[in-house]
């Protein structure tokens, strides 16, 4: 990698300057695509900020950019005007250029901010040169708010600054009035005044009357050293404008402005809703606007004018629909700072806000809303509802267009069909079941953000309050006892004060759930079960016959039971008992109570018996450690010998 370019950037005070290929130009011996030449900002500027023309100009500092973005003029340095005057200031940016596999290259970009430079955005080289408005035939002070050369003084090191002043030499006097310093008129024999006199409020312009034509004076300003000596340093020659106002003139009154709303990359006319004034003295063509500061999200243009931005236009341009805003690719709102004048009154500041609408928004649904079964309610979060467009939309509003069927949405505890992203983020939006007959629900919302809408469906599921066994594999061909070590809704029973019951929805693929006869005297064998209760589990009345996969050699496999769990006053929930099975191994200790083992195994042990489950399991039922776990098949025989 190699870096060319001057690596210096000269910026006018308070302005925005793009980085260019003259300033910063990277290349690689491999001829890498400029998109892949990546700059990382190691240390950002101190006197301003670096930002991307098409991204948020108010948000986070820019961290990365590419050479391609530099070529496109999209990487901008903005100097932020300090409160204290200065003549020249220096800033640096430390960058790291990378493009694997090449080694990184460090670079420093020097930024010079100077009043010396010729600046189209700032015709004066002084800290302030704003001109003066004076009523016809009257006088007005020229203060430091209108004329200030403090920045020339700032070029002197601070210890010596008190011994210096700025000398203004009037090179062309006002034609319709006169300048006075401490009430003494200035004239060709005495054409000077000082910055210190200006600061003391001693400079006055007195209009001579006889019309409202423009006036002004030209001057040269330079540093003056101790005892009036001329010293080397910055100097400037410029003009100070004086506008004479009709004493009967009524100033224009700006009207309330509605922000312009526009989708990015489009064009929209500016109307009186955005810019209008009430001025009985002036025609619309006499009311002039000047752009003082433009946002980064687009520019103003005049129909019939050039394609580029305009900085001056009239109320007539607005009224006739000739003025338009052209949005660039930025998604960020911005504000034009304007000054408006009828030419006879001092300019008034005005602003025009431009809100960039997304062309589309999307509701992001990252997960369904899970409702804990015992609670029957849950707060929505950004996991369920979050609006994004070209950026996140924290101001999004939601309206229910189809409510949930088995519950309702509440905000602050009361049913609500509208809510905001902020209320979601603060956990105030809750879904609560009101009809406890379904384990799931859904609702549809319409999201609205910056004038654009989108709909989405939020799914709701109930999370069962059920402790499910998660141990090793179960033996194929055996019947194991289904009890609270495998399925336990005891906590749900305690929370609801009811006996939870289960409904078998699906499975197992290989096997079945059965009710175990209480004793051999009970008629019939095991009965197929589709519903059972927590009490059945606790009483040890249930068995799971673990089948063998048909049509293939015995091998480990997976199976599952899908159950619906019900309890009083809470919604039902669907839960799954997933388990692995393997061919029965008599030598292996199984961690569940076995009610019977495969027939073939019994034959081998010399004990022919039907493969129906045994009756009451005897000591094993109350044993905390299942009999089979005590000693494989012999343990099983011992425990079941007399059943």
């Amino acid at each position: 990698l190699s870096l060319e370019g001057s690596r210096t950037l000269t910026v006018c005070p308070g302005s925005v300057q793009p980085l260019s290929s003259q300033t910063l130009r990277a290349s690689s011996s491999a001829g890498t695509d400029p998109q892949l030449l990546l700059y990382r900002v190691v240390r950002g500027p101190q006197l301003g900020r670096l930002f991307h023309a098409q991204q948020d100009s108010t948000g986070e500092a820019l961290v990365n950019f590419t050479q391609a973005e530099v070529y496109a003029g999209n990487i901008l340095y903005e100097h932020e005007m300090p409160t204290e005057p200065f003549w020249e200031a220096h800033d640096t940016l430390e960058l790291q250029l990378s493009s694997p596999p090449a080694r990184d290259v460090a670079a420093t970009l020097a930024v010079a901010v100077s009043f010396e430079a010729a600046c189209p955005q700032r015709p004066s080289h002084l800290w302030k040169n704003k001109g003066l408005w004076v009523p016809e035939g009257q006088r007005a002070k020229i203060t430091m708010a209108a004329l200030d050369a403090s920045n020339l003084l700032a070029s002197v090191p601070s210890p010596q600054r008190l011994e210096h002043d700025v000398l203004f030499q009037v090179t062309q006097f006002p034609s319709r009035g006169q300048l006075l310093v401490s009430e003494e008129p200035l004239h060709a024999g005495q054409p000077h005044f000082l910055q210190s006199q200006l600061a003391a409020g001693q400079l006055v312009y007195a209009h001579g009357g006889g019309g409202t034509q423009q006036d002004g004076f030209h001057f040269r300003a330079h540093l003056q050293g101790p005892a009036g000596a001329t010293v080397a340093g910055p100097q400037t020659s410029e003009a100070f404008a004086i506008t004479v106002r009709d004493v009967n003139e009524r100033p224009p009154q700006p009207q309330a402005s509605v922000p312009l709303r526009i989708t990015r990359g489009s064009r929209a006319p500016i109307s009186r809703a955005q810019l209008s004034v009430v001025d009985p003295d002036s025609a619309p063509g006499e009311i002039e606007y000047e752009v003082q500061r433009a946002p980064h999200n687009g520019f103003l243009s005049l129909v019939g004018g050039g394609p580029g931005p305009v900085t001056h236009f009239t109320q007539a341009d607005v009224d006739s629909g000739r003025l338009a805003f052209v949005a660039n690719g930025s998604s960020v709102a911005g504000v034009f700072q304007l000054s408006m004048s009828d030419g006879a009154s001092p300019p008034l500041p005005m602003s025009l806000a431009v809100d960039i609408l997304p062309s589309a928004i999307e509701v992001q649904l990252q997960a369904p809303l899970e409702v804990p079964q015992a609670l029957g309610r849950s707060s929505l979060s950004q996991q369920q509802l979050r609006v994004v467009s070209d950026r996140e939309e924290p101001e999004a509003a939601y309206r229910l267009i189809q409510g949930p069927k088995y519950g309702h949405l509440l905000v602050g505890g009361r049913p609500a069909s509208a809510f905001s992203q902020l209320q979601i983020d603060q956990g105030e939006v809750v879904f609560a079941f009101t009809n406890f007959s379904s384990s799931h629900d859904h609702f549809r919302v319409l999201a609205l953000a910056r004038g654009v809408n989108a709909s989405a469906v939020v799914n709701i599921t109930v999370r069962a309050l059920l402790h499910v066994w998660a141990g090793g594999p179960w033996p194929q061909g055996a019947t194991l006892r289904l009890d609270p070590t495998i399925l336990d809704a005891g906590e749900l029973a305690n929370r609801t004060g009811s006996v939870p019951h289960f409904r078998l929805l699906e499975g197992p693929r290989h096997g079945r759930v059965v009710r175990v006869p209480r004793a051999r005297t009970e008629p019939g064998g095991s009965q197929l079960v589709e519903q059972f209760t927590q009490q059945d589990l606790e009483d040890g009345r249930l068995g799971l016959e673990v089948g063998r996969p048909e049509g293939r050699a015995p091998s480990p496999t997976g199976d599952s039971l899908t159950l619906e769990l019900w309890a009083q006053g809470v919604p039902p929930a669907v839960a799954s008992l997933d388990f692995a099975t393997e061919p029965y191994n008599a030598a292996r200790p199984y961690s569940v109570a076995l009610l019977s083992v495969p027939e073939a195994t019994r034959m081998e042990a010399g004990k022919p018996e039907s493969s129906t489950p045994t009756g009451e399991p005897g000591p094993m039922a109350s044993s905390p450690v299942p009999a089979v776990a005590k000693g494989g098949f012999l343990g099983f025989l011992e425990a079941n010998m007399f059943s």
């Epitope: 609670l375 029957g376 309610r377 309206r399 229910l400 267009i401 189809q402 409510g403 069927k405 309702h408 949405l409 509440l410 602050g412 505890g413 009361r414 049913p415 609500a416 069909s417 509208a418 609560a432 079941f433 009101t434 009809n435 406890f436 609801t496 004060g497 009083q568 006053g569």
Partner: antibody, heavy 112, light 107 residues
């Protein structure tokens, strides 16, 4: 603030259908969540009859479900109650409400 | 259906008294409880929603509390205009149900 106003006949013959309408002002029936009908037998407590929601779905008290229909007319911002096969036991003051605010109630007497 | 039982059915009290009315649900109602005030010949008025949130315009002498199945309405200092019948109502599970009412009379 939302205001509700019931209207309909004050006298209904047994076995006929009681019909009442609630007119909502100061809010839209497509934005408030629940629009309920509640009744109160003379000198007795309150009994919820049913509701229609902002999206037009219904729920009714199981004790009255077979006889009740609640519908709405969004263009008029109204919702209505129909109770069929009435008997003297349906004599009551009928209220429409969104629970935050209630109509003033209308007495319906079932008598021949 | 969830049964709502209010106690007492009626009570006599004087202006300035602290009055407490309780409401018991036949099962937990997750704080989804409203309290209403009804005066003769008038419609009920919402006082408190979601157990303890004061409805707009309701004086702060009214307060609510409770959880699970047991809920309370308290009037900290009874005023002449507070003599009325009070009802609780649950909106935790359909059908919505009301308590039978508590009549607060002047002693």
């Amino acid at each position: 603030q939302v205001q509700l106003q019931e209207s309909g006949p004050g006298l209904v013959k047994p076995s006929q259908t009681l019909s009442l309408t609630c007119t909502v002002s100061g809010g839209s029936i497509t934005s408030g969540y629940y629009w309920n009908w509640i009744r109160q037998h003379p000198g007795k407590g309150l009994e919820w009859i049913g509701y229609i929601t902002f999206d037009g779905s219904n729920n009714y008290n199981p004790s009255l479900k077979s006889r009740v229909t609640i519908s709405r007319d969004t263009s008029k911002n109204q919702f209505s109650l129909k109770l069929s096969s009435v008997t003297a036991a349906d004599t009551a003051v009928y209220y429409c409400a969104d629970f935050d605010y209630w109509g003033q109630g209308t007495l319906v007497t079932v008598s021949s | 259906d969830i049964q709502m039982t209010q106690s007492p059915s009626s009570l006599s009290a004087s202006v300035g008294d602290r009055v407490t009315i309780t409401c018991r649900a036949s099962q937990g109602i997750r704080n989804y409880l409203n309290w209403y005030q009804q005066k003769p010949g008038k419609a009920p008025k919402l006082l408190i929603y979601y157990t303890s949130s004061l409805h707009s315009g309701v004086p702060s002498r009214f307060s609510g509390s409770g959880s699970g199945t047991d809920y309370t309405l308290t009037i900290s200092s009874l005023q002449p205009e507070d003599f009325a019948t009070y009802y609780c109502q649950q909106y935790s599970a359909l059908p919505w149900t009301f308590g039978q009412g508590t009549k607060v009379e002047i002693k």
